[in-house]
């Protein structure tokens, strides 16, 4: 049941944090204006990954896409595809953990099949949210970086003039959601992982009476009523008698039908 | 709106200098990016420099890069352009115009004319011997 649990939980988080994803991508606000010095304005400038946006006090609001521009850096390429591959790494980690699911039965799918699907995906979602935190926190280091650049050059001036700035650009709303739903899907991953544990069905269940002597399980030993139970002076399973009792070794070697209780 | 005047034009000889200014004035906190183009006799108007309010680094077009310098004094709502060691080929009508969107850091504003709002009327610029 908690099995069931943590995997459910773990897809539902996954779910909400790919969603961020995808809408922190296709957001407009990765960076606005700073209205430092400047708390009066007709007008408000942010930009996303795509597109630039201009909203005037009327409410009136124009976008315009990049591809008219003369260069676009390496870095802002960058962002894109890690968030791209965000995505898509989340899409199919949903796509394959829906069939994981314990709750949801599909043919005559083995339990060991479900855990190596859950596991699968639960790498997926940690590698998606991985790709969306760093993306994010590379276009935040880009801002930072451009912070302190120009508003060094508002003391300094740039080549031999004076270069002031009227406005600065700082955090948007998408870095936010994208850094708290990177989060997420990172935590879901974890969770698909854990679960994947409790789902993968161990193999010592069917073996353990006979290779072990350890524990409080007895084994039925046909011609005699002495059997060990791991305690006292025969904690080596060592040879009781020969009626039928055999060490660790030949049990391994030669399994009988009275070796599986 | 925005009106931008442009002065500082002139003739010079190869391997002189300039020094190109452009007063904004009107609604000028709609002037984020703002730019240097150039049209030469019989040619296209390309773009020479262009520089964005709030953003440090410049964007110099391969045949001016090293010669010609763009800066903004965003208090007087000015932008210069700067142009040393100028060739013939330098010669040209200079226009400023001024671009109310930004991009993010790298990005380089404006690029095309079509991007670009408010323009000025033009200051020529000779280079001759």
């Known amino acids: 049941m908690a099995v069931t649990a943590c995997q459910g939980l773990g897809f539902v988080v996954s779910l909400i944090g790919i969603a961020g994803i995808i809408a922190a991508t296709c957001m407009d606000q990765w960076s606005t204006q700073d209205l430092y010095n400047n708390p009066v304005t007709a007008v408000f400038n942010y930009q996303g990954l795509w597109r630039s946006c201009v909203r005037e006090s009327s409410g009136f609001t124009e976008c315009r896409g990049y591809f008219t521009l003369l260069g676009l850096p390496a870095m802002l390429q960058a962002v894109r595809a890690l968030m791209i591959v965000g995505i898509v790494l989340g899409a199919i980690g949903l796509l394959v953990s829906i069939f994981a699911l314990k709750c949801i039965r599909i043919g005559s799918m083995e339990d060991s099949a479900k855990a190596n699907m859950t596991l699968t995906s639960g790498i997926m979602f940690i590698v998606s949210g991985l790709c969306a935190i760093a993306g994010v926190s590379v276009f935040a280091n880009m801002l930072v970086t451009n912070f302190w650049m120009s508003t060094a050059n508002m003391y300094t001036g740039m080549g031999g003039m004076v270069q002031t700035v009227q406005t600065r650009y700082t955090f948007g709303a998408a870095l936010f959601v994208g850094w708290v739903a990177g989060g997420l899907t990172l935590i879901g991953g974890v969770m698909m992982c854990i679960a994947c544990r409790g789902l993968a069905p161990e193999e010592t269940n069917y073996k353990a009476v006979s290779y072990h002597a350890s524990g409080h399980s007895v084994a039925y030993k046909p011609g005699g009523f002495k059997a060990s139970t791991g305690f006292g002076s025969n904690t080596k399973n060592k040879k009781i008698y020969d009626g039928g009792a055999r060490t660790e070794d030949e049990v391994q070697s030669y399994p009988s039908k009275h070796d599986y209780v | 709106e925005v009106q931008l005047v442009e002065s500082g034009g002139g003739s010079v000889q190869p391997g002189g200098s300039l020094s190109l200014s452009c007063a904004a004035s009107?609604?000028?906190?709609?002037?984020?990016?703002m730019a240097w183009f150039r049209q030469g006799p019989g040619k296209e108007r390309e773009v020479v420099a262009t520089?964005?309010?709030?953003?440090?680094?410049?964007y110099y077009t391969d045949s001016v890069k090293g010669r010609f310098t763009i800066s903004q004094d965003a208090d007087k709502n000015r932008v210069y352009l700067q142009m040393d060691s100028l060739k013939p080929e330098d010669t040209a009508m200079y226009y400023c115009?001024?671009?109310?969107?930004?991009?993010?850091?790298?990005?380089?504003?404006?690029?095309?004319?079509?991007?670009?709002?408010?323009w000025g009327q033009g200051t020529r610029v000779t280079v001759s011997s």
């Open positions: 115009a001024a671009d109310r969107f930004t991009y993010p850091p790298g990005v380089i504003c404006g690029g095309i004319s079509e991007n670009y709002r408010y």
């Open positions: 009107g609604d000028t906190f709609r002037a984020k990016c």
């Open positions: 520089i964005q309010s709030g953003y440090y680094r410049p």
